[in-house]
């Protein structure tokens, strides 16, 4: 069917439109365009005859139309009067007529709108404001935006005059916003510049800050007043009804008890003509003394002494408070408070009880804190540690050992070699060592305040030959798919390379194998039964090499799903039933049987002589591994038939 499509349907003035013809018949005599919904010679725009290839303008031709060979009509430089219907009349080659009608609408390009207002400074809760979007334009839609959002739903917002006017009834301060209007028609949309609504409001009831009303003698009084207001409020202060000053802040230094009284802030808005006041009552108290802490033992010994801390001075009807490490007191059986909370006792002090400790005296206004006190807890020495941890050294190197023991006061150190005192230093240094320097090296740490001593002995071997290494393990019986195992090659030796072999081969590449600690430690993550192999570590330096004895990893696994053999499930009556159950497991699992759910025997083999049809049923084998804590089972159905009834049945064992 012949149809006309207008592209575009909505056309802007001055632009062009194409009346595009669809399904134009093939063989034509000619065609003609008419303005309107019917063929009317007086309103013919242009016609075209195929045979003569001649386009003939009609009475409605304006000079802006172009007709195309496919019968489509282009109208340029569109004017408002072009709006409406257009009819194409087609005469086919057999002189049969066909016609189709299309239409388009013409709209003007809109100018940028602006907003006019009937009230530039409305007063809150009193005035209304009417915004009007200019200019008034035919066939235009008017939209409004508040802070770039579409209009909120509110009974105080009313659109009128075809949405061209936006009225805000009883304006509030929250209406202070950016307002924009937008004009739209099908061919254009333009938005106005924003208009900021300036709502006059307030003053609200002023707020006086800070809120506290109790002060200590000698403090500075600094009160600030604020009231929401547009334009900003003018402030005045009154003390006990007497005018003081016209400022937003009131400052009185070094107040006394005489400054107690009622303080009034008055806020005034010159535009709205409104005044609001707020009163606060200030009380000034005399200053209490600053507390301090006394101790019955300034140098307590760890795990021996108790310490009593007392908050001074003693004041009647006073609440005493304590803090440790700037926190309130923790709950601990070693912390005890006296009945009046003035004395804090630490029973059997530890090195962690150093503090700081603070006490406080609470009065009507505030809490006065003491200066912090730190306890000097005497402790140690702990067992000294000798570093580095190497025990094997090559001749010719320097031996440098350092000793450290936790202690307060710091420990005094002594070194002994094979029981002979060497020197009273924290570090021992011997240059260019030989095999003769092998021996027992003892570090002794002494705390002069507590009188305690502690020693640590280390065997040092000086040898060109490396010792035979050994493998230590953090887990001798790891469980498959669960545990990790860390092998460490001992001893730790200086300038030594560590190597590993599995089943006589170098380490395979695997994301589950990880070397660390200078290759001295080999970690197997998520062990599997296949990891149950012989592991050997080796040490080597520039003059010697040695290998450990193999360590075989005993991986606990299973039990896997058991298998019942033989696989036969059909038997003849009178045969012997001999079922064997097997499950891969380390250690070997425990076996048990159930027939039709009834427990039988705890053996790997189930034997029943001369079975009958009564032995039909489900035979379940259960396996459990006590080491892995895992269980498994399998069920097999057995059918026993009377003798000679069914060929192909097993005769049994």
């Amino acid at each position: 069917k012949l149809t006309i499509e207008s592209t575009p349907f909505n056309v802007a003035e001055g632009k062009e439109v194409l009346l595009l013809v669809h399904n134009l018949p093939q063989h034509l005599f000619g065609y003609s365009w008419y303005k309107g919904e019917r063929v009317d010679g007086n309103r013919q725009i242009i016609g075209y005859v195929i045979g003569t290839q001649q386009a003939t303008p009609g009475p409605a031709y304006s000079g802006r139309e172009i007709i195309y060979p496919n019968a489509s009509l282009l109208i340029q430089n569109i004017i408002q009067n072009d709006t409406g219907f257009y009819t194409l009349h087609v005469i086919k080659s057999d002189l049969v007529n066909e016609e189709a009608t299309g239409q388009f609408r013409v709209y003007p390009e809109l100018p940028k709108p602006s907003i006019s207002s009937n009230n530039s400074k409305p007063v809150e809760d009193k005035d209304a404001v009417a915004f009007t979007c200019e200019p008034e334009t035919q066939d235009a839609t008017y939209l409004w935006w508040v802070n770039n959002q579409s209009l909120p739903v509110s009974p105080r917002l009313q659109l009128s005059n075809g949405n061209r006017t936006l009225t805000l009834f009883n304006v509030t301060r929250n209406d202070t916003a950016s307002y924009k209007c937008e004009t739209q028609n099908p061919v254009s949309a333009r938005r106005s510049d924003s208009v900021i609504l300036n709502v006059l409001y307030g003053p609200d009831a002023p707020t006086i800050s800070p809120l506290n009303t109790s002060y200590r003698s000698g403090e500075n009084l600094n009160l600030s007043c604020h009231a929401a207001s547009n334009p900003p409020a003018q402030y005045s202060w009154f003390v006990n009804g007497t005018f003081q000053q016209s400022t937003q802040e009131l400052f009185i230094p070094n107040i006394t008890v005489n400054n107690s009284g009622s303080y009034t802030c008055q806020a005034h808005n010159s535009d709205t003509g409104l005044n609001r006041t707020t009163v606060t009552t200030i009380t000034v108290y005399a200053e209490p003394p600053k507390p301090f802490i006394t101790s019955n033992n300034s140098n307590p010994v760890e795990d021996e002494d108790a310490v009593a801390l007392t908050c001074e001075p003693e004041i009647q009807n006073t609440t005493y408070l304590w803090w440790v490490n700037n926190q309130s007191l923790p709950v601990s059986p070693r912390l005890q408070l006296s009945n009046d909370n003035r004395t804090l006792t630490l029973l059997s002090v530890t090195r962690n009880d150093v503090g700081p400790y603070e006490c406080g005296i609470q009065n009507e206004l505030s809490v006065d804190h003491s200066d912090p006190v730190i306890l000097n807890v005497l402790y140690g020495p702990d067992d000294p540690t000798i570093s580095p941890s190497y025990t094997y050294y090559r001749p010719g190197v320097n031996l440098s050992l350092s000793c450290h023991a936790a202690s307060n006061p710091p420990a005094q150190y002594s070194w002994l070699i094979d029981g002979n005192i060497q020197q009273h230093t924290q570090e021992l240094f011997i240059s260019n060592i030989t095999e003769k320097n092998s021996g027992l090296y003892t570090c002794q740490a002494n705390n002069s305040a507590s009188g305690h001593s502690r020693t640590t002995v280390k065997t040092i071997t000086v040898s060109a030959e490396l010792p035979k290494p050994s493998i230590s393990s953090n887990n001798s019986k790891p469980v498959e798919d669960k545990d990790a195992v860390a092998f460490t090659c001992e001893p730790e030796a200086q300038n030594t390379t560590y190597l590993w072999w599995v089943n006589g081969q170098s380490l395979p590449v695997s994301p589950r194998l990880q070397l660390s600690n200078g290759n001295r430690t080999l970690t197997l993550f998520n062990v599997t039964r296949n990891d149950a192999r012989a592991y050997v570590c080796g040490i080597q330096n520039s003059v010697s090499a040695n290998r450990s004895d193999p360590v075989t990893l005993d991986v606990l696994y299973g039990p896997d799903t058991p298998i019942i053999s033989p696989p036969d499930s059909s038997y003849l009556s009178g045969a012997n039933l001999n079922l064997s159950c097997h499950s891969a497991s380390n250690p070997s699992p425990q076996y048990s049987w159930r027939i039709n759910g009834i427990p039988q025997q705890h053996t790997q083999v189930l034997f029943i002589a001369k079975i009958t049809p009564n032995n039909n049923g489900t035979y379940a084998c259960f396996v459990s591994n006590l080491a892995t804590g895992r269980n498994n089972s399998i069920v097999k159905s057995i059918t026993v038939s009377a003798s000679g009834t069914s060929p192909g049945l097993s005769a049994g064992a």
């Epitope: 010679g41 005859v49 003569t52 003939t56 009349h89 005469i91 080659s93 057999d94 002189l95 007529n97």
Partner: antibody, heavy 121, light 106 residues
């Protein structure tokens, strides 16, 4: 000046045949659509047939379809109407007419003076 | 086929009269209607095409109007040479004529 001159009319027995000719001059015949209209004695006008400028487009009234054939020879500027199986009701004055080459609903702007065909035994 | 009905079939009028002849189609034919004038013994002559377009050389006292199914031929002021038979023709398919209206001198 446009001229259309019909010929070939006459008396013919029912069931007989007749061929009418129309000699055209004064316009570009080869690009013009042509047609035949007849008028029985004392009766109104009846459109009979039309033909396109290139002979490929032809139309007929139901009353003559299958019996009459319209054709043209553009080299001779001549229009033809071959009438077979003639009946008594085919008796009429046959007019040759011209369709103007304008993009308006079809209309006949020039007519010949007509030729009389009488079908009678 | 589309039937064309003219009314009246005959009409008597005097010189100077305004005369109206109507033509009705059995279904809508848009503006596809032509009017012809025929005098006795003569070939028809085209007056109006496309319902309202006046053929070149035809006096302006002849006018046509209508669309869809109802059409009118109007002679605003009858002249002696206007007494003849008038036919309407639909330009659809096939191009059928009305039965004619005979305009006689009163």
């Amino acid at each position: 000046e446009v001229q259309l001159l019909e010929s070939g009319g006459g008396l013919v027995q029912p069931g007989g045949s007749l061929r009418l000719s129309c000699a055209a001059s004064g316009f570009t015949f080869s690009s013009s659509y042509m047609g035949w209209v007849r008028q029985a004695p004392g009766k109104g006008l009846e459109w009979v047939s039309s033909i396109g400028s290139g002979s490929y487009s032809t139309s007929y009234a139901d009353s003559v379809k299958g019996r009459f054939t319209i054709s043209r020879d553009n080299s001779k500027n001549t229009l033809y109407l071959q009438m077979n199986s003639l009946r008594a009701e085919d008796t009429a004055v046959y007019y040759c007419a011209h369709y103007p080459s304008v993009p308006f609903p079809p209309h006949l702007d020039y007519w010949g003076q007509g030729t009389l065909v009488t079908v009678s035994s | 086929d589309i039937q064309m009905t003219q009314s009246p079939s005959s009409l008597s009028a005097s010189v100077g009269d305004r005369v109206t002849i109507t033509c009705r189609a059995s279904q809508s034919i848009s503006s596809y209607l032509n009017w012809y004038q025929q005098k006795p013994g003569k070939a028809p002559k085209l007056l109006i095409y496309a319902a309202s377009s006046l053929q070149s050389g035809v006096p302006s006292r002849f006018s046509g109007s209508g669309s869809g199914t109802d059409f009118t031929l109007t002679i605003s002021s009858l002249q002696p040479e206007d007494f003849a038979t008038y036919y309407c023709q639909q330009a659809g398919n096939p191009h059928t004529f009305g039965q004619g209206t005979k305009l006689e001198i009163k």
